[in-house]
């Protein structure tokens, strides 16, 4: 994210369409408390950030309230008076959902359909992910909204799910970050489980007909 | 057919002031946002100036900043540039230009798929 | 503001070359880069977008590279319409143009 001016390195994340964090990391002014200036609208003065992050004792970014704001951040890292790196940038791009919300799970016979609370924006991917102790890499599947249903699953089998949000590329572009995942949940025969064994049990043996 | 047809540009004595017009048709005027290129004569292309879908933020370049005004009026399909305090280096075609993307992302300006033909504007004494 | 440097300024080219332009960014843009052609008179077209994204009725012939600070547009053999000038633009914060690269016939 960060272009090399002076050797300084940023990184932006937008959280939710709430907070912004830039961080930077500057090898130059590795003991030096850069101060960091902000504007979101090219007419109004810069403002100084008032809720730095502090590395090792030194500034090393910025959170900033900016609820909803379909905006360009304009911001400046200075070393006193003297500009080490500026920049503006629209904030949808960096954009990072919050974690899925009042996840449900709604089993019948072998699909099982999760939902959650859709976000307040749109143009967002909610992906489940499964696995059973028989599976050697997590399953998905996404959607465009959290009603994801997932089918042909053995009804015997324990399965782990998780679920997170992730920005559409073709829209917010290659730079936002998915959500975090929510917590694991584990399921079987339509029952929650406190866990699924990690060596799976051998499959019962078929009775002939 | 998607269409951009830009009028109001002409002559102008320096500190003097113009408003461009630019009307749209053929898509869905309100969902994108809208901006201003112009080119001086024998030059590049410099953005001046964008609006979201909305007309709720607008964007300025620097050298036009606090003499340019760009708004919308959705309802008639049209935009509007008005520029006072016009200088020497002000003279140029002036080009309206349609967002490539419509999105949830309301105010983002991105690429411009679509292109009126231009108005000259000249600032001479 | 960031700054956008293309090279060459001018190109001299046949029919049937292929040729190269490139596009540097002073900072990183992460693939936000459009690509249009301008003839004589005329209002720009977009060609690409997001780096590398071909615009809906623009020749296969053309294509776009890159990221972060570095970024190509590629013709892969040139015909007669594709002689005007090129301009890059970022569209990672305020919108900031090349200064244009104009393709000329050899």
């Known amino acids: 994210q960060g272009g090399a001016a002076e050797g300084v390195q940023i990184q932006i994340i937008y959280f939710n369409l709430e907070t912004v964090q830039v961080t930077w990391n500057a090898s130059k002014y590795s003991r030096t408390n850069l101060t960091f200036h902000y504007r979101f609208n090219g007419d109004e003065a810069y403002d100084q950030c008032t809720n730095y992050l502090l590395q090792e004792g030194h500034t090393s970014g910025c959170l900033l309230d900016a609820e909803q704001r379909d905006d360009i951040l304009y911001f400046s890292i200075r070393n006193g008076t003297h500009p080490v790196f500026t920049a503006s940038r629209w904030m949808v791009y960096y954009l990072k959902p919050s974690s899925p919300k009042h996840v449900r799970f709604s089993w019948h016979q072998d699909a099982v359909t999760v939902t959650c609370s859709d976000l307040s924006y749109g143009d967002l991917l909610y992906e489940v992910q499964y696995r059973s102790p028989f599976d050697t890499e997590w399953q998905s599947k996404q959607e465009n909204t959290c009603n994801v249903t997932i089918e042909g699953l053995d009804a015997e089998k324990c399965y782990s799910f998780w679920v997170r949000v992730k920005a559409m590329e073709d829209v917010y572009g290659p730079d936002t970050y998915p959500s975090d995942w929510s917590e694991v949940t584990c399921w079987q025969r339509g029952e929650i489980r406190d866990a699924c064994a990690e060596t799976p049990t051998p499959p019962k043996p078929k009775l002939s007909k | 057919e998607v269409q951009l047809l830009e009028s109001g540009g002409g002559l102008v004595q320096p500190g003097g002031s113009l408003r461009l017009s630019c009307a749209a048709s053929?898509?869905?005027?309100?969902?994108?946002?809208m901006n201003w290129v112009r080119q001086a004569p024998g030059k590049g292309l410099e953005w001046v100036s964008g609006?979201?879908?909305?007309?709720?933020?607008?964007y300025y370049a620097d050298s036009v900043k606090g003499r340019f005004t760009f708004s919308r009026d959705n309802s008639k399909n049209t935009l509007y540039l008005q520029m006072i305090s016009l200088r020497a280096e002000d003279t140029a075609v002036y080009y309206c230009?349609?967002?490539?993307?419509?999105?949830?992302?309301?105010?983002?300006?991105?690429?411009?798929?679509?292109w009126g033909q231009g108005t000259m504007v000249t600032v001479s004494s | 503001d960031i700054q956008m440097t293309q090279s060459p300024s001018t190109l001299s080219a046949s029919v049937g070359d292929r040729v190269t332009i490139t596009c540097r960014a002073s900072?990183?843009?992460?693939?936000?880069l459009a690509w249009y052609q301008q003839k004589p008179g005329k209002a720009p077209k977009l060609l690409i977008y997001?780096?590398?994204s071909l615009e809906s009725g623009v020749p296969s012939r053309f294509s776009g590279s890159g990221s972060g600070t570095e970024f190509t547009l590629t013709i892969s053999s040139l015909q007669p319409d594709d002689f005007a000038t090129y301009y890059c633009?970022?569209?990672?914060?305020?919108?900031?143009f090349g200064q244009g690269t104009r393709l000329e016939i050899k």
């Open positions: 900072q990183s843009i992460s693939s936000w």
């Open positions: 053929g898509f869905t005027f309100s969902s994108y946002a």
């Open positions: 997001k780096a590398s």
């Open positions: 633009q970022q569209y990672v914060g305020l919108i900031t």
């Open positions: 230009a349609k967002d490539q993307r419509i999105t949830m992302v309301r105010g983002v300006i991105g690429a411009f798929d679509i």
């Open positions: 609006i979201s879908g909305s007309g709720g933020s607008t």
